[in-house]
């Protein structure tokens, strides 16, 4: 999906009133320094393609986001705010959601969601040069 | 059993506000759209505005901007839609209705409308 | 803010077939692949008879069929029965700031 039709402004009130508030409510109990981040973006839809995979594609150790609370209000904002979002991306997000298994909180899960969270920061802060 | 079940039929003077409530049952509310959409009598439908309670987004059709209000408890279940500054143009039967889970702009439930007058 | 465009009304014996069109713009039945048509007898709520331009819910019969062309949609109800009497609404979504449109309607005769 090509992001670069969407309504930025309205999915960054969308990520600051609730997403982030989700996304440390996951993160509880975990240092802010005990993950490194490696993933980065360069722009607001790199942000969200990058956020897309990490939120609802499985990766080794870490099958289960996609049913978590900030994960189905990613999937929202970017319904309502990104025009053809769900033509080309619920059903495939659906069809994982029916094969995966119970959910589990594992360390490379931890991981991902932290870095999840220095992607969201980055596209919240759009005009700061890529480090 | 799901359903949408709306508040009775309401007489309102012009100059006041009327507000409607719609209670969601047998569905899990947080995360489909309710719209609210309009008939005048022997008159088509017309939309006037969502709100998807998981994000709290609510998203207004022009013509109803700053007038309209639509909000949702989601620990009830029920949404809910004022509008103010009411003229006779707006004795219309409301409807709320549920968009899709992700796919809000469709309509699969709706509730068995409220009566609106507006008369002096 | 104008609403989409559908012909007032429309007619048809028993087992004919019949299409309402509905007219939009670039911006919304154009833009979009997101037209969804609504079935209203007299007195009862809206049904949702067909969406994203062709799908049908479930419970609804596969004679009514939807497809888009452009800025226009039509719906067509083949095999026409006495119980398809009824107004037809077409609906699009029409951008993140607008959201939706109906059209006009159009009153399905049965003859």
């Known amino acids: 999906y090509d992001f670069t039709n969407c309504d930025f402004e309205k999915i960054k009130a969308a990520y600051l009133s609730t997403i982030s508030k989700d996304l440390i409510t996951y993160m509880s109990g975990t240092k802010s320094t005990e993950f490194n981040n490696t993933v980065s973006c360069s722009n607001r839809p790199h942000c969200l393609t990058e956020i897309q995979s990490l939120t609802f594609n499985p990766t080794a150790g870490c099958a289960s986001l996609a049913k978590e609370m900030f994960a189905m209000k990613t999937k929202a904002a970017l319904a309502i705010w990104c025009p053809g979002y769900s033509e080309t991306q619920i059903n495939a997000t659906q069809a994982m959601k029916k094969r995966r298994k119970r959910k589990v909180t594992t360390n490379k899960c931890l991981e991902q969601v932290s870095q999840l969270q220095g992607l969201w920061r980055r596209f919240n802060r759009p005009l700061l040069k890529q480090q | 059993q799901v359903q949408l079940v709306q508040s009775g039929a309401e007489v309102k003077k012009p100059g006041s506000s009327v507000k409607v409530s719609c209670k969601a049952s047998?569905?899990?509310?947080?995360?489909?759209?309710i719209s609210w959409v309009r008939q005048a009598p022997g008159q088509g439908l017309e939309w006037l505005g969502v709100i998807v309670p998981l994000v709290d987004v609510t998203i207004y059709a022009e013509k109803f901007q700053g007038r309209v209000t639509i909000t949702a408890d989601t620990s009830t279940s029920t949404a809910y839609m004022e509008l103010s500054s009411l003229r006779s143009e707006d004795t219309a039967v409301y409807y709320c209705?549920?968009?899709?889970?992700?796919?809000?702009?469709?309509?699969?439930?709706w509730g068995q409308g409220t009566l609106v007058t507006v008369s002096s | 803010q104008s609403a989409l465009t559908q012909p007032p009304s429309a007619s048809g014996s028993p087992g004919q077939s019949v299409t309402i069109s509905c007219t939009g713009t670039?911006?919304?039945?154009?833009?979009?692949?997101?037209v969804s048509w609504y079935q209203q007898h007299p007195g009862k709520a809206p049904k949702l008879m067909i969406y994203?331009?062709?799908k049908r819910p479930s419970g609804v019969p596969d004679r009514f069929s939807g497809s888009k062309s452009g800025n226009t949609a039509s719906l067509t109800v083949s095999g026409l029965q006495a119980e398809d009497e009824a107004d037809y609404y077409c609906?699009?979504?029409?951008?993140?700031?607008?959201?939706?449109?109906f059209g006009g309607g159009t009153k399905l005769t049965v003859l």
């Open positions: 670039i911006s919304d039945i154009g833009g979009y692949n997101r």
């Open positions: 609906s699009s979504y029409a951008g993140t700031d607008t959201f939706v449109f």
């Open positions: 047998g569905f899990t509310f947080g995360s489909y759209g």
């Open positions: 994203e331009v062709s």
């Open positions: 209705a549920r968009g899709q889970e992700y796919f809000y702009w469709y309509f699969d439930l």
